[in-house]
């Protein structure tokens, strides 16, 4: 089973948000298929997405085993209709991915404001804790469970009648802010990992939520 006319994959790219992690590559296959292998720096190669005609492979199940490890993947190219044969000694063409450390490199997903409650001149704003596919003792962990105090949220809040955005920060999922009585406010949150020094340290902003709509409660 030769590998003539197979083209090595290229542009191997990790796409990862809240630890959901997919390896993508090119080219779209013509008369060839791919198999992906992944390993930690010190570990054995594990094969995934066997003989696929796709140009992506979901590697979440592997990387969530230890999100602080550094992973390397490689994509092998085989002729279409390839069947594994024990007698084959010729190594198919393959390409290595960049290294990927999930804890440092996964993008932060768009957060969601779960609720807000006004009591007098204070408003408590709660950010929804997103679940991830990372497990500990057979239990799925939330983003806060994984990142702990490394994850903070920035709250932007403003009077509905104004444009200037005040800010508050928390390393829990709750904010308690002072507001002017009788004013309606709008809120948006952003997840941040300050210890990161790369472009993925901030999430996109949550959808804006405003007082006077269904997510909020008001009590005197």
């Amino acid at each position: 089973s030769g590998t003539t006319n197979t083209v090595a994959a290229y542009n191997l790219t990790w796409k990862s948000t809240n630890f959901k992690t997919i390896l993508e590559w090119e080219p779209k296959p013509i008369n060839q298929v791919y198999t992906v292998q992944i390993s930690t720096k010190s570990g054995d190669w594990k094969s995934k997405c066997f003989y696929t005609a796709d140009t992506e492979c979901d590697l979440t199940d592997e990387i969530v085993k230890d999100v602080k490890q550094t992973y390397l993947a490689r994509v092998f190219s085989y002729p279409a209709g390839h069947v594994e044969s024990t007698g084959s000694t010729e190594e198919p063409p393959y390409e290595n991915s960049p290294e990927f450390t999930p804890y440092l490199e996964t993008n932060l997903g768009q957060p969601t404001i779960q609720s807000f409650e006004q009591v007098g001149t204070k408003v408590n704003v709660t950010v929804q804790d997103e679940w991830t596919l990372v497990r500990r003792n057979d239990t799925f962990l939330s983003l806060r469970d994984v990142f702990g105090k490394d994850l903070i949220y920035t709250l932007y809040y403003w009077k509905s009648s104004s444009s200037g955005k005040k800010t508050a920060k928390t390393n829990t999922n709750e904010f308690l802010i002072d507001v002017d009585k009788g004013e309606n406010y709008c809120f948006s949150v952003q997840a941040v990992i300050p210890s990161r020094r790369t472009a993925n340290r901030k999430s996109t902003d949550s959808p804006v939520e405003c007082m006077g709509h269904e997510k909020g409660e008001s009590r005197e």
Epitope: I152, T154, Y156, K165, K166, K169, Q190, P194, A199, R201
Partner: antibody, heavy 121, light 107 residues
Framework: EVQLVESGGGLVQPGGSLRLSCAAS????????IHWVRQAPGKGLEWVGY????????YYADSVKGRFTISADTSKNTAYLQMNSLRAEDTAVYYC??????????????WGQGTLVTVSS | DIQMTQSPSSLSASVGDRVTITCRAS??????VAWYQQKPGKAPKLLIY???FLYSGVPSRFSGSRSGTDFTLTISSLQPEDFATYYC?????????FGQGTKVEIK
């Protein structure tokens, strides 16, 4: 090396306009927050306003609200301070500064060299 | 807005002296206070962040502490290059506010 370089200062008449630039290098402004601070001759530091370049959100000191506008162009890695309806009391050295967080506590670790704005007839 | 009341506004000291500058916040600001040093004609430089953490590259003779809403910058042994103006700043709420500054002069 992280650097902030302001430009655009100068002499302007009362009621006039000026646009200051804050060109960043060594980091991506969209990953941080940019503040403008001014210092009148012989006086202390006065905060002017901030921008989060990743979403364009801004907030201004009452003394400049409605007259000054902060913007950012992430493709140029540059923040701007547009100053309109200038008054004599706006005369100051204007600094831009990069804000970062240590957990939830903010600090301004890099500052530009400052650019002098003089409002006088 | 939160007021940061800094004292003294100026002080005279000699090389080797221990110098203390204080700032009082008008309300709780947790640890969200930074200290900056500014020399004439230059931009401010960060010394202390989060009330008590020494910024990278800053000499260890500088230290910061907090007691409730009172914040202190201490220079344990004043050096010739330390003669400058020092500012505290809170960024617990928007807008961030500075103290009035303390000018440290040579006695």
């Amino acid at each position: 090396e992280v650097q902030l370089v302001e430009s655009g200062g100068g002499l302007v008449q009362p009621g006039g306009s000026l646009r200051l630039s804050c060109a960043a290098s060594g980091f991506t402004i969209g990953s941080y927050w940019i503040h403008w601070v001014r210092q009148a001759p012989g006086k202390g530091l006065e905060w002017v306003g901030y921008i989060d370049p990743s979403n364009g959100y801004t907030y201004y000191a009452d003394s400049v609200k409605g007259r000054f506008t902060i913007s950012a162009d992430t493709s140029k890695n540059t923040a701007y301070l547009q100053m309109n309806s200038l008054r004599a009391e706006d005369t100051a050295v204007y600094y831009c500064a990069r804000a970062d967080y240590y957990y939830v506590d903010e600090y301004w670790d890099y500052w530009g060299q400052g650019t002098l704005v003089t409002v006088s007839s | 807005d939160i007021q940061m009341t800094q004292s003294p506004s100026s002080l005279s000291a000699s090389v080797g002296d221990r110098v203390t500058i204080t700032c009082r916040a008008s309300q709780d600001v947790n640890t969200a206070v930074a200290w900056y040093q500014q020399k004439p004609g230059k931009a401010p430089k960060l010394l202390i962040y989060s009330a008590s953490f020494l910024y990278s590259g800053v000499p260890s003779r500088f230290s910061g502490s907090r007691s409730g809403t009172d914040f202190t910058l201490t220079i344990s042994s004043l050096q010739p290059e330390d003669f400058a103006t020092y500012y505290c700043q809170q960024h617990y709420t928007t807008p961030p506010t500075f103290g009035q500054g303390t000018k440290v002069e040579i006695k």
